[in-house]
């Protein structure tokens, strides 16, 4: 089979007339009356068809032509290439050989970006015109007027620092400073010894250097430096004015401190989110917090607070907090975190709820107040849900039962235990699943519609009777499901029995939606039309 073979990569600058030579195999010789070869360049928006010349069965040349593509937001564009013989026979291109069209000036507005382009593009910096171009597009009167990266000595003038991150760090040093800018050298050697923060040396890290664009350096110790802030200086090989950049903002040396931890106590198992308050806490590039000598899992920080998740403690009692910000170690003997014994759950009352949950549960136990945001959890039919609890004191909290409503399974009329019931109390694993409880879930109440149309007409002062089932779950003890029935937005006085809710309707007239609520269950059986007495007495 005739086919195109890989050879050297094909790079074609936009607007330059040049031939393109392709290696091939088994190219047939066109017979008389047959059309020859053509190269098709599938350029988006402006496809090009160029006559090709077959040299022999293994070589072909797309004749002199120039190519272009739209826009300056793409610096190089790989273009699919087809070779066609005799008008419509496409020569195989199994390796998908492409032509790379490119524009030197596109996305290369600075000398550094220009010189770091792929050397095969042969782009260079036209000094006089301050633009990236091919050599013959630069009106250069001396060799130095057009710089190319291949000249090992090439170096861009006018380096610029655009951004510093972070902008503050501890005096003790160790902060990794990220400097973003333009023309910041072409090779690491260009800047290896050229970065300072004021008088303090900042040692660039080779693995994080991005040619021309980014330097990451580690700031040295500034303990002996009196100035509290300083400009950052980058010198590209030497510090002559053309090769020296100063930062637009100053880097500030600070002394981070902390003075409070909140909450100041939590369970021995850890897992408590704590906030450590202080000043300059967002300084430097790296932070590590330990509580009682163990790492506190860092979440986020700003200048006034660090948040982290406490590790398990070794024993109940106070534990020192240490913060390392780069080479600065922060301590405060006045600020200690207190580990308490893990909370326990002794009783849940009542020991039941309904499918939709939402009923109030009183939970008694020990050390409950050591956890700031306890949650009750239930798992049933493969679905797990949680609800927040309100802590009154160390021995009492109130939770709303989680809903266990799911499409797969619902509790039978006599109730059913959930697969799991427990509490999320920071990292206290022993409470995640309570094996000691006999907690049951009952089905939600089922209420009849007010009528087949959902509309019930009622005389004033007549009671509204809502029929249904599962209205009173057959739970042990004296606790009952607490109902609210609203006529519009007005609650009515209720009497509840096994099969009906008797509602002394408020003194209303007109149409009102009826809503029944019990825990997390809410349902509207329809609309009530109450006629006024005056309408009823009309003939």
């Amino acid at each position: 089979c005739p086919q195109i073979l890989p050879s050297t990569q094909i790079y074609v600058p936009v607007g330059v007339v040049k031939p393109i030579t392709l290696a091939a195999r088994n190219l047939p010789q066109p017979q008389s009356g047959q059309r020859g070869y053509e190269c098709l360049f599938h350029i988006p928006g402006s496809p090009a068809r160029v006559t090709a010349l077959r040299f022999n069965s293994s070589s072909l040349q797309c004749q002199n032509s120039s190519y272009s593509y739209e826009g300056n937001d793409v610096s190089d564009l790989p273009v699919n290439l087809s070779v066609v013989w005799n008008g419509n026979f496409v020569i195989d291109n199994p390796q998908n050989i492409q032509a790379h069209l490119y524009k030197c000036p596109a996305l290369r507005e600075s000398c550094g970006l220009c010189l770091k382009a792929d050397p095969r593009f042969e782009c260079g910096w036209c000094v006089a015109e301050r633009r990236c171009s091919l050599r013959h597009h630069c009106a250069a009167d001396t060799p130095a007027s057009w710089m190319h990266a291949r000249h090992g000595s090439s170096r861009c003038t006018d380096p610029k620092i655009l951004k510093l991150s972070p902008e503050t760090g501890p005096r003790q040093g160790g902060t990794r400073l990220t400097i973003t800018g333009e023309n910041l050298g072409l090779r690491f050697e260009d800047v290896r010894l050229g970065v300072r923060v004021g008088k303090v040396l900042c040692s660039p890290v080779e693995s994080e250097y991005i040619s021309a664009e980014q330097i990451v350096c580690e700031i040295g110790d500034a303990s002996s430096v009196r100035a509290h802030d300083a400009l950052v200086e980058v010198c590209v090989r030497d510090c002559s004015p053309h090769y020296r950049a100063l930062s637009p903002k100053r880097f500030t040396f600070v002394t981070p401190t902390f003075y409070r931890v909140s909450p100041s106590r939590g369970p021995l198992s850890g897992g408590t989110w704590i906030g450590i308050e202080g000043s300059h806490l967002n300084a430097g590039s790296d932070v590590a917090v330990s509580v009682g000598g163990r790492p506190c899992s860092f979440s986020w920080r700003n200048s006034r607070e660090i948040r982290c998740l406490t590790p398990p403690g070794q024993s109940p009692g106070s534990a020192p907090i240490i913060i390392n910000i780069n080479r600065a170690q922060l301590t405060n003997p006045e600020v200690k975190y207190n580990y308490t014994e893990d909370p326990t759950i002794l009783r849940i009352d009542p020991e039941w709820s309904i499918n939709s949950g939402g009923t109030l549960l009183t939970v008694t136990g020990t050390n409950l107040a050591t956890v700031r945001e306890p949650r009750i959890r239930a798992k049933y039919g493969g679905i797990e849900r949680e609800n927040g609890c309100l802590v009154y004191n160390d021995t009492t909290m109130v939770c709303r039962a989680p809903s266990v409503a799911n499409p797969v399974r619902s509790p039978p009329e006599l109730g059913e235990r959930p697969d799991e019931l427990g509490f999320v109390m920071d990292n206290v694993r022993s409470l995640l699943v309570l094996n000691s409880t006999s907690f049951l879930y009952y089905p939600d109440p089922v209420l009849e519609p007010l009528s087949p149309t959902g509309l019930l007409e009622l005389k004033p002062s007549s009671p509204l009777i809502l029929k249904g089932r599962n209205l009173l779950p057959p739970a042990p003890g004296n606790s009952r499901l607490n109902y609210t029935v609203l006529i519009g937005s007005t609650p009515c006085t209720l009497t509840v029995s096994e099969t009906q809710l008797l509602c002394e309707a408020p003194n209303l007239t007109g149409q009102h939606k009826v809503t029944v609520r019990a825990g997390g269950f809410e349902f509207s059986p329809g609309t009530l039309q109450v006629y006024s007495d005056s309408l009823l007495t009309l003939p």
Epitope: S451, P452, T453, G454, L455, R469, K513, E522
Partner: antibody, heavy 128, light 107 residues
Framework: QVQLQESGPGLVKPSETLSLTCTVS??????????WGWIRQPPGKGLEWIGS???????YYNPSLKSRVTISVDTSKNQFSLKLSSVTAADTAVYYC????????????????????WGQGTTVTVSS | DIQMTQSPSSLSASVGDSVTITCQAS??????LNWYQQKPGKAPELLIY???ELHSGVPSRFSGSGSGTDFTFTISSLEAEDAATYYC?????????FGQGTKVEIE
């Protein structure tokens, strides 16, 4: 799918009680999503709703027939029944039973859907 | 009770024609209107519910529109099997009431 079948005598004497039963197959009469209704159609005339019942036994009747109508449900047999007392020749009609769905609108609110499944009807003639 | 007035009482049309039936309620019934089709000797069948919703399995040539008191039922392209009596019925208030029917014949 759900099917309804009416059954009962085709001839009733004036002043007696007409009794019909509708048997539901292919679904449960105890579903909370449906009412079950009776409709009649006198020869050559239009449709007249007689009444509807919920599986719990709650009934709703056409005021024009209320004094003579009783509809009951037997969930164990998956049936509901119609009794119409003191019949006259004007009660001669084809009697249909039908399923009357109660659909939940947004936010768990009922709206009327329309009688979607009907029995094939049974002709009752009132004559001595 | 809510009275339902249907018109015309009968009409004759050719296959492929568009046919329109109207139904008027004696008071506002929102969108709680249904349309039924009854063929001779058969039980009625639900076509349209809630004014304009097509019941499952019903061909899309049947459509309904309107709300309040005035409603329209349309068969966009009449077919021979559409010869039947069509009834409107309201479900807004008990007792449910029906129109007197429109008999559609094929010419």
């Amino acid at each position: 799918q759900v099917q309804l079948q009416e059954s009962g005598p085709g001839l009733v004497k004036p002043s007696e009680t007409l009794s019909l039963t509708c048997t539901v197959s292919g679904g449960s009469i105890s579903s909370s999503s449906y009412y079950w209704g009776w409709i009649r159609q006198p020869p050559g005339k239009g449709l007249e709703w007689i009444g509807s019942i919920y599986y719990s036994g709650s009934t709703y009747y056409n005021p024009s027939l209320k004094s003579r109508v009783t509809i009951s449900v037997d969930t164990s047999k998956n049936q509901f029944s119609l009794k119409l007392s003191s019949v006259t020749a004007a009660d001669t009609a084809v009697y249909y039973c039908a399923r009357d769905p109660v659909q939940l609108e947004h936010s768990r609110y009922y709206y009327y859907y329309g009688m979607d499944v009907w029995g094939q009807g049974t002709t009752v003639t009132v004559s001595s | 009770d809510i009275q339902m007035t249907q018109s015309p009482s009968s009409l004759s049309a050719s296959v492929g024609d568009s046919v329109t039936i109207t139904c008027q309620a004696s008071q506002d019934i929102s969108s709680y209107l249904n349309w039924y089709q009854q063929k001779p000797g058969k039980a009625p069948e639900l076509l349209i519910y809630y004014g304009s919703e097509l019941h499952s399995g019903v061909p899309s040539r049947f459509s309904g529109s309107g709300s309040g008191t005035d409603f329209t039922f349309t068969i966009s392209s009449l077919e021979a099997e559409d010869a039947a009596t069509y009834y409107c019925g309201q479900g807004n208030r008990l007792p449910y009431t029906f129109g007197q029917g429109t008999k559609v014949e094929i010419e």
